[in-house]
Amino acid sequence: TQNKALPENIKYGIVLDAGSSHTSLYIYKWPAEKENDTGVVHQVEECRVKGPGISKYVQKVNEIGIYLTDCMERAREVIPRSQHQETPVYLGATAGMRLLRMESEELADRVLDVVERSLSNYPFDFQGARIITGQEEGAYGWITINYLLGKFSQKTRWFSIVPYETNNQETFGALDLGGASTQITFVPQNQTTESPDNALQFRLYGKDYNVYTHSFLCYGKDQALWQKLAKDIQVASNEILRDPCFHPGYKKVVNVSDLYKTPCTKRFEMTLPFQQFEIQGIGNYQQCHQSVLELFNTSYCPYSQCAFNGIFLPPLQGDFGAFSAFYFVMNFLNLTSEKVSQEKVTEMMKKFCSQPWEEIKTSYAGVKEKYLSEYCFSGTYILSLLLQGYHFTADSWEHIHFIGKIQGSDAGWTLGYMLNLTNMIPAEQPLSTPLSHSTYV
């Protein structure tokens, strides 16, 4: 019996990320006796809920229960039955629900009420559903990637756990792109901030962090596209919009009522002499880039320096992990390699956008046309946001690491959210015990 491992006391947690375009359920596990250690929590499962984001269920709330069933049943299978009752479940809704709440608190409440009722029917320890703030989304994303990269650990290692991890304790900045918002969070060189709204202070594992964060609502890739369309249709001479952000030969009819449904297009709203218009792709990266830049107001800045729209942004500092849609889009375009320079990315985007739609459809036959059609815009938008919005340069581009997973866990706000709500990130450095008391006898 000398080397026989005792059954470990394992704990589980579930977080649902109710995003603007879809909902994902994440299951995390960790050894119970190590819950205050850094880096011990890891993701065991991601389940993507079939269908759109919960904000789209406002007219069909009776379908929410069925919508969540598959992934919640999957959680039931993955987590041992004996652990069900003590497994916390959290649902955090992000920018899609922030936008719905902006239109109507009643409708947002109704959706969340039905979500809560549905999740309460499962045998887990449901802890509530809420709309998280943009600040929280940014902060928890930053905590997640730095936790997974081992940046909070005081033990210096002679090996690296991930390819781009340096042995220093300098934290990574976090760049998160969703469908309806985008977040930038990092520790600036200068501790003082000109904008208290963008300042966060943390004490984690015995160390103080002064963090800058901002969430740009309406600047997620989907809402940015709606903004661009609403802006461009203002100057269209008829119901045809020749759009450089879509492949040559691509055609799609858009309802004006859909265009003006979101608060994000409010500033471009006007009475148009038609109810529908047709997008006709012309596939020109340079023109698309120019059109996208018009979404960023850089003419006004009440601070020493700004990102765009008058929002304070300190000088960029250190390495950044770019995840969520930053990663999904760049990965699809095969542009996530550390070796690909910003100039090369631009060159590849020019080539990709100019490819005829029929050719693109053939090359990517397995990809849904709705998603496939938008990669030219999304790639262009990402470049514009990072370079002109956040002021990365050709040189600092190499400090951006497009990250999908770290150590098998998805980069995103959900892990940081759970670590915080389960009190698994201590303010002080835990006293290290000489031996783990549960592993071997």
Partner: antibody
Amino acid sequence: QVQLVQSGAEVKKPGASVKVSCKASGYTFTDYNMHWVRQAPGQRLEWIGYIVPLNGGSTFNQKFKGRATITVDTSARTAYMELSSLRSEDTAVYYCARGGTRFAYWGQGTLVTVSS
Amino acid sequence: DIVMTQSPDSLAVSLGERATINCRASESVDNFGVSFMYWYQQKPGQPPKLLIYGASNQGSGVPDRFSGSGSGTDFTLTISSLQAEDVAVYYCQQTKEVPYTFGGGTKVEIK
């Protein structure tokens, strides 16, 4: 906690303009719309319009269109309502209120008196 | 525009007694299963205070004696046991459609 603090009382001559401010604190300013409502002496409350602080887009009660302008300064977390071509019947208390469809938080009100 | 008609214009009720105020909309204020109907209390020199939202939900910090009911076009605000501090003007409001409109108000006094 959420607070909306409005500028002080104003006395204006007919034909002039007035600009009332509303400074917000205690929440993410760009996450909620800001509405403006007025109440003339002994009258019912009257909705003027609202602004989306996120991008400056606004919607007005047709009655005030062309005469009312609503703007924001997001860095100062402040919304403004300007009413032009004032007439005596514009004498009222003007309120800002935060909300999408639910006006849960109101400013203390700004009395605007139009008198020759 | 949706016209909101409140009744009565004024109401005198004894302390501890029930007060009932009605509000009728010129068309339904329901949408997506939600009633976009609100009740506010206003005391002299103060801004309105949200009492009820979504026709029947209590605003935060609102005493339990205030309740709302109704759907479609007909709504009621009830004060189950009138207290001295409830003397005020009460307004209904709809936000289903722009322009958002208010009722004419009901003045509640102590008999």
